[in-house]
Interface confidence: medium
Amino acid sequence: SSSDTCGPCEPASCPPLPPLGCLLGETRDACGCCPMCARGEGEPCGGGGAGRGYCAPGMECVKSRKRRKGKAGAAAGGPGVSGVCVCKSRYPVCGSDGTTYPSGCQLRAASQRAESRGEKAITQVSKGTCEQGPSIVTPPKDIWNVTGAQVYLSCEVIGIPTPVLIWNKVKRGHYGVQRTELLPGDRDNLAIQTRGGPEKHEVTGWVLVSPLSKEDAGEYECHASNSQGQASASAKITVVDALHEIPVKKGEGAEL
């Protein structure tokens, strides 16, 4: 069915389209005559070079060296099939539903699915991943320890764009008034460390206190912010005189 064997176009002899229509729109056969359903991402396509036209807009027919074992199963589309439709643009996009899609094609497919369920169509809001306010993945844990010990608090946050993480010491004044002191300040026994990860758009931060003194007792806040918002979590450091003063919950040791 390549173009050099195309006879005159006779629409009456074209196979009918599905009565409910084509989900991804219509395309023409290799001769540009008969309408047929456009094929979506991962669906088989091809045969001759002209068969590339069978994929939906924004997709291309990529020849596969060997038969795929994917969704299509063993009979990858019958005789003459030599490829699958893949998205031309393979960068992530942000949908109007707040979801990041690996490609514009996957967003369009999700939109078609939504519409087939009677829901609102999903449109592309922007290229790249959807922005989201920070959230705390792993909050810092309360710590009990003796003076002179080395302790640390850790905090893991995520957001898009990647959040900025800072540490505050929370000071509660009279009448419940709260003020925060940005760390490390001028403390010699306190160090702050931050690194990206472990996942994309994540940041992990640590407060290292060594040696621990009575003045270090109190509430420490991990605070993350980006253009979309902010999030925080806090933990207490309690300084005791002797190890036996550290409370131990049944079945777990104290965080030292």
Partner: nanobody, 127 residues
Framework: VQLQESGGGLVQTGGSLRLSCAAS??????????MGWFRHAPGKEREFLTA????????YYTDSVKGRSTISRDNAKNTVYLQLNNLKPEDTAVYYC???????????????????WGQGTQVTVSS
């Protein structure tokens, strides 16, 4: 190629049923087929209810079952399912599954389009 429905039976009004359709056959690649469910009530035409594409990504429901039924498929088990909820006496019929070779994102709704049919399973809804 064989399609075998199961899961039918007698159910009270407002009840639920889950119908299964298992496909088998030596040269039958289930994941290359679009699947549909139809029903045939005495004295009526065979009625199309719902369809699912070969990949399972897209589903279609007619108004008679929309909102109270779910079609799904498990290509690893060569099986398509129809969950029927809030059953009414007018749902009483023989339910058939059907298969059409298609690796295109499209739905098929007419009896003539489907190549393989099961024997059917009886669903009776009593008031």
């Amino acid at each position: 190629v064989q399609l075998q429905e199961s899961g039918g039976g007698l159910v009270q009004t407002g009840g639920s049923l889950r119908l299964s359709c298992a496909a088998s056959g030596r040269s039958f690649t289930f994941s290359s087929y679009a699947m549909g469910w139809f029903r045939h009530a005495p004295g009526k035409e065979r009625e199309f209810l719902t369809a699912i594409t070969w990949s399972g990504d897209y589903t279609y429901y007619t108004d008679s079952v929309k909102g109270r039924s779910t079609i799904s498929r498990d290509n690893a088990k060569n099986t398509v399912y129809l969950q029927l909820n809030n059953l009414k006496p007018e749902d009483t019929a023989v339910y058939y599954c059907a298969a059409k070779f298609s690796q295109v994102s499209a739905f098929f709704a007419t009896v003539s389009e489907y190549e393989y049919w099961g024997q059917g399973t009886q669903v009776t809804v009593s008031s």
